[in-house]
């Protein structure tokens, strides 16, 4: 009675169950009555990451420096190459096929989360009591200067883009 289903790591062909090829190897011949499934290792710069019956291995991803990419992890016969972006850039997608420059946070906004190779800068508006007067991919919102602790008084109120201006207290005549 020919099988209708096969065990894990097997596949059904010509009414018989054949072994799948292990990761890192491709199929060159299905099993027969007299021979086992024949597999060959993937070549240099190729991979297969699952038990499979593929007749061709996949090419490793190319991290194109012209697109701002570099190798984060070199591929093996069982894994694809992982790309990331050069310093100051981040991936445009999860697949990391190209990079864009990290965004800067405008004056009035500070960096909530610094960018990584895979995520952009996250900015947040400076709340009352804080300011940012630069466009930066690193600077957080800074607290206004506390004039009181310096025995000074506020001469000019701060905004989300400017610090307060402190001055001496008026002397009583």
């Amino acid at each position: 009675e020919p099988p209708t289903a096969c065990r894990e790591k097997q596949y059904l062909i010509n009414s018989q169950c054949c072994s799948l090829c292990q990761p890192g190897q491709k199929l060159v011949s299905d099993c027969t009555e007299f021979t086992e499934t024949e597999c060959l290792p993937c070549g240099e710069s190729e991979f297969l990451d699952t038990w499979n019956r593929e007749t061709h291995c996949h090419q490793h991803k190319y991290c194109d420096p012209n697109l701002g990419l570099r190798v984060q992890q070199k591929g093996t016969s069982e894994t694809d190459t992982i790309c990331t972006c050069e310093e100051g850039w981040h991936c445009t997608s999860e697949a990391c096929e190209s990079c864009v420059l990290h965004r800067s946070c405008s004056p009035g906004f500070g960096v909530k989360q610094i960018a990584t190779g895979v995520s952009d800068t996250i900015c947040e508006p400076c709340p009352v009591g804080f300011f940012s007067n630069v466009s930066s991919a690193f600077e957080k919102c800074h607290p206004w200067t506390s004039c009181e602790t310096k025995d000074l008084v506020v001469q000019q109120a701060g905004t989300n883009k400017t610090d307060v201006v402190c001055g001496p207290q008026d002397r009583l005549r």
């Epitope: 097997q10 169950c17 054949c18 072994s19 060159v28 011949s29 099993c31 027969t32 009555e33 007299f34 021979t35 086992e36 499934t37 024949e38 060959l40 007749t55 061709h56």
Partner: antibody, heavy 114, light 112 residues
Framework: QVQLKESGPGLVAPSQSLSITCTVS????????VHWVRQPPGKGLEWLGV???????SYNSALMSRLSISKDNSKSQVFLKMNSLQTDDTAMYYC????????WGAGTTVTVSS | DVVMTQTPLSLPVSLGDQASISCRSS???????????LHWYLQKPGQSPGLLIY???NRFSGVPDRFSGSGSGTDFTLKISRVEAEDLGVYFC?????????FGGGTKLEIK
């Protein structure tokens, strides 16, 4: 039905190269591999190599440096080439289809002699 | 490579006798699938090898039931229960579990 027929030069001078053709019928070279096996006179069988359906090859490591197997799918022909022949390469050379262990060619005799 | 060792080299028998040929492999011929690809061939004088037994114990079509194969792992046996004149020739064991395929050195079955 499956058939294989080897044809070769018969006599080869030492240090020269050998070319043998295996013509198959009853199956397609795009779906099955072909193996080469040889047998020196009065001795045992030695596996030489295989060309798989997709064109990949596997060779006997002891002979790899002077052996090459290729094929022409459209003509149903497989070719064995061996370089730098010596007298101990004198043998009957057989081809057989992968998965068709029951069907061997009649073989072609190769004698290496000056 | 897997080395296949066949014994005896020569086996003189009388017609009607039982004959037994041993084949040992240098490593297990059991594939991870559980199958064992050990085969037996008979090569009659002036002919190509002909398949007798495949996967240890399966008789190939048309092979008489006086031929039987047994064994497992690295140790295999071919038995001929009652030798007939047409059985004379050289018997080879062969493994196709591992590439490169390898063959035993052969056992010549001859009349005593």
């Amino acid at each position: 039905q499956v058939q294989l027929k080897e044809s070769g030069p018969g006599l080869v001078a030492p240090s020269q190269s050998l070319s043998i053709t295996c013509t198959v019928s009853g199956f397609s070279l795009t779906s099955s591999g072909v193996h080469w096996v040889r047998q020196p006179p009065g001795k045992g069988l030695e596996w030489l190599g295989v060309i798989w359906a997709g064109g990949d090859t596997s060779y006997n490591s002891a002979l790899m440096s002077r052996l090459s197997i290729s094929k022409d799918n459209s003509k149903s022909q497989v070719f064995l080439k061996m370089n730098s022949l010596q007298t101990d390469d004198t043998a009957m050379y057989y081809c057989l289809g992968h998965g068709h262990l029951d069907v061997w060619g009649a073989g072609t005799t190769v004698t290496v002699s000056s | 490579d897997v080395v296949m060792t066949q014994t005896p080299l020569s086996l003189p028998v009388s017609l009607g006798d039982q004959a037994s040929i041993s084949c040992r492999s240098s490593q297990s011929l059991v594939h991870s699938s559980g199958n064992t690809y050990l085969h037996w061939y008979l090569q009659k004088p002036g002919q190509s090898p002909g398949l007798l037994i495949y996967k240890v114990s399966n008789r190939f079509s048309g092979v008489p039931d006086r031929f039987s194969g047994s064994g497992s792992g690295t140790d295999f046996t071919l038995k001929i229960s009652r030798v007939e004149a047409e059985d004379l020739g050289v018997y080879f064991c062969s493994q196709t579990t591992h590439v490169p395929w390898t063959f035993g050195g052969g056992t010549k079955l001859e009349i005593k």
